[in-house]
Interface confidence: low
């Protein structure tokens, strides 16, 4: 039978009467090994208990007296069975033997479910010497026990190569419920159902839990730990804990916060980060994610010009990273832009919607009736041109780049010309005489570049020639520019 | 005795909300759930949503999540439910009904042990 | 949504006779906890309903014992032993076991 002792008992006589072979409980002790100093508490237990001598494994003396007498099996006295206490209270606890004279270097171990004590453990073996045995007791204390101390003690002696072992003294630390799992936070769709859970364990058991809803009790009834609680559905933010109860009293588990999902919040501070003829790179502050997180975004994109038709132009991308490149936009042009973002309840407002601008663009046609004739007096190519029609947003031109490249054989060879935005002719010098030049004409405006004209090729004669009437840039549909001699 | 005294009936426009109360008497209003009851004429029973007037916790149908909004007041052990953007599928008599013991809106339950006494909804131009 | 079908819209019976009402859910009700949360209504003619019996075969209060429900899965039956007159009017199942709660479309008791 288990014998219990509570911490509201008085503590037992260290030593109930006198070991065999009248040793005196007054007797001071021979010897003394502490295997660790340290606060002995004032609670004790009953290191022995009067009764038979423990049977369950003892060690029969192979060796006699001298008048041969058989020496009576080994075995630890009795002892408090079971120690129940409250955390952070002190504790003590023996087992003591009586072991003949004739045995040398006794030694008792602690051993705590199944594993040996060793270290900085209070454990004190005392030894009190008679006649014809000693007594040993073997003390182990802890100063403020914690639920790791929960567990089975024994002690353990060697003799003879036998191994002598005690009853074990069962150790229960009783505290406030401990949680070892408190309901998370979580992030809900408003008026759907979701789950909680609180478990919670002692000793002492059972541990009882109450849900706590905005400092309101959900439950009349307590449940048996562990508890899920079911919310039907919210239609507002609350927090939750859980009480966990037993018969020490009641511990409560964090507040966690219960967030209903919403769309997003608008993003903003739509900025410019960069801008180009056809495009437009622009960045956002993400607004408020509404508990769930960003899914897309989408960037609006309207012409600003009062005489455009209004139409929104619609470019979907990733939430991140807050940054989009909108393309295919026309130069020298003013746009109204503005982002809205998605989570999984839906799409947020637009951001405040912001002016935007692009660039000039480069001319998008190049000039016209390119013509090239070669004025061997001077020693000069002349070329004529039509100035293209220009758009708008191509920007103000500034002028044209003239590419020239002479060929003869072995040698190929490329010159740029630049000429003022007036301008529809050109003069260039002759680079190499027997060879071939061929002209290409673009418009240049602060946008950039446009597109070269169709390549017009003259050849160039030894000196001496006379005269070439002119080239020029093939009428539409006719495959290469013709070279008029 | 448990009782659920509704308000009276109730004609509006198409495009309005109406608000119907139930005032309840005779048990502990905060301990059960209170739900709300369509019965268009001549047709069956449905359930619109139920409120749990402990927590402040409700629960729809999908077919009235949105335009249904179930509340109540604790100090006159009240419940409302009002309906918004009424078509003239919305005329039928709504029931206010008893559930279960505190908060088992979404759980298996044997509900609708008391019922009021209808109101009668009737949108019309 | 579970979709509960009562067969029979009218049911035409002599005072003293029984009766019987057949009740089919589009799924089983037998929930987790190992109840049926199947329920039985009865509306007389100008009056809200009322809750006669509860978990296939529990009579509320009040309830005079010639009502018995029974049933299971997705079958369910409400007799009545001896028809009275009090009797008459339109019989609703409906569940409880899958949100949402459904009904079903009623039988209408009336005198042969």
């Known amino acids: 039978a288990i014998t219990e002792a509570r911490e509201e008992a008085k503590p037992y006589p260290l030593f109930p009467g006198p070991f065999p072979g009248s040793l005196q409980t007054d007797h001071t002790p021979l010897l003394s090994l502490p295997h660790a100093s340290g606060y002995q508490p004032a609670l004790m237990f009953s290191p022995t208990q009067p009764g038979r001598p423990h049977t369950g494994n003892v060690a029969i003396p192979q060796v006699t007296s001298v008048e041969s007498k058989p020496l009576p099996p080994l075995a630890f006295k009795h002892t408090v069975g079971h120690i129940i206490l409250s955390e952070h209270k002190g504790v003590k606890f023996n087992c003591s033997i009586s072991v003949p004279n004739i045995y040398q270097d006794t030694t008792i171990s602690w051993w705590k479910d199944g594993k040996e004590l060793l270290g900085a453990h209070h454990a004190i073996t005392q030894f009190y010497p008679d006649d014809e045995v000693t007594a040993i007791i073997a003390s182990f204390s802890i100063t403020s026990v914690q639920r790791s101390d929960n567990g089975s003690y024994i002690c353990k002696m060697k003799i003879n190569n036998e191994e002598i072992v005690s009853d074990p003294i069962y150790i229960e630390v009783q505290g406030l419920p401990h949680f070892t799992k408190q309901p998370e936070s979580m992030n809900v769709t408003r008026n759907t159902a979701f789950n909680l859970t609180c478990q919670a364990v002692g000793p002492p058991e059972p541990v009882n839990i109450f849900w706590v809803q905005n400092s309101s009790r959900v439950n009349e009834q307590p449940e048996k730990s562990p508890s899920v609680l079911t919310v039907p559905g919210l239609t507002e933010m609350a927090v939750f804990s859980c009480e966990a109860h037993n018969d020490k009293g009641l511990t409560v588990s964090k507040g966690v916060q219960i967030n209903i999902k919403a769309i997003p919040s608008p993003p903003t501070e739509v900025s410019i980060r960069n801008s180009t003829a056809h495009s437009i790179l622009i960045s956002w502050v993400p607004g408020f994610d509404g508990y769930s997180p960003f899914r897309n975004c989408s960037i609006q994109v309207k012409e600003a010009d009062p005489l455009s038709n209004g139409s929104v132009m619609i470019f979907n991308t990733s939430a991140l990273p807050h940054l989009y490149q909108i393309k295919q936009l026309q130069a020298l042009a003013n746009y109204s832009i503005g982002v809205s973002c998605m989570n999984e309840i839906g799409w947020s407002a637009v951001s405040p919607w912001i002016l935007a601008s692009t660039t000039e663009g480069a001319p998008s046609v190049a000039p016209l009736n390119v013509t090239v004739f070669l004025n061997e007096s001077s020693d000069n190519v002349d070329i004529r041109w039509m100035k293209p029609p220009t758009k708008q947003q191509d920007g103000e031109l500034v002028g044209y780049r003239i590419s020239h490249v002479w060929q003869s054989a072995g040698i190929s060879k490329e010159l740029l010309e630049e000429v003022g935005q007036n301008g529809s002719r050109a003069r260039i010098s002759v680079q190499v005489h027997n060879a071939t030049c061929t002209v290409r004409i673009a418009a240049v405006t602060r946008g950039g570049v446009g597109p070269f004209s169709d390549p017009v090729k003259i050849f160039i004669p030894a000196h001496g020639w006379v005269d070439y009437a002119p080239s020029s840039t093939p009428a539409p549909g006719n495959a290469d520019p013709v070279l008029i001699i | 005795e448990v009782q659920l005294q509704q308000s009276g009936p109730e004609l509006v426009k198409p495009g309005a909300s109406v608000k119907i109360s139930c005032k309840t008497s005779?048990?502990?209003?905060?301990?059960?759930?209170m739900h709300w009851v369509k019965q268009s004429h001549g047709k069956s029973l449905e359930w619109l949503g139920g409120?749990?007037?402990?927590?402040?916790?409700?629960s729809y149908n999908q077919r009235f999540q949105g335009r249904a909004t179930l509340t109540v007041d604790k100090s006159s052990s009240t419940a409302y439910m009002e309906l918004r953007s009424l078509t003239s599928d919305d005329s039928a008599v709504y029931y206010c009904t008893r559930g279960d013991l505190l908060w088992s809106l979404l759980l298996p339950g044997n509900y609708f042990d008391y019922w009021g006494q209808g109101t009668t909804l009737t949108v019309s131009s | 949504d579970v979709v509960m079908t009562q067969s029979s819209l009218t049911l035409s019976v002599t005072i003293g006779q029984p009766a019987s009402i057949s009740c089919k859910s589009s799924q089983s009700l037998l929930d987790s906890d190992g109840k049926t949360y199947l329920n039985w209504l009865l509306q007389r003619p100008g009056q809200s309903p009322k809750r006669l019996i509860y978990?296939?075969?529990k009579l509320d209060s009040g309830v005079p014992d010639r009502f018995t429900g029974s049933g299971s899965g997705t079958d369910f039956t409400l007799k009545i032993s001896r028809v009275e007159a009090e009797d008459l009017g339109v019989y609703y199942c409906?569940?409880?076991?899958?949100?949402?709660?459904?009904f079903g479309g009623g039988t209408k008791l009336e005198i042969k």
């Open positions: 005779g048990y502990t209003f905060t301990e059960y759930t």
């Open positions: 409120f749990n007037p402990n927590n402040v916790i409700t």
């Open positions: 409906w569940q409880g076991t899958h949100f949402p709660w459904t």
């Open positions: 978990l296939v075969s």
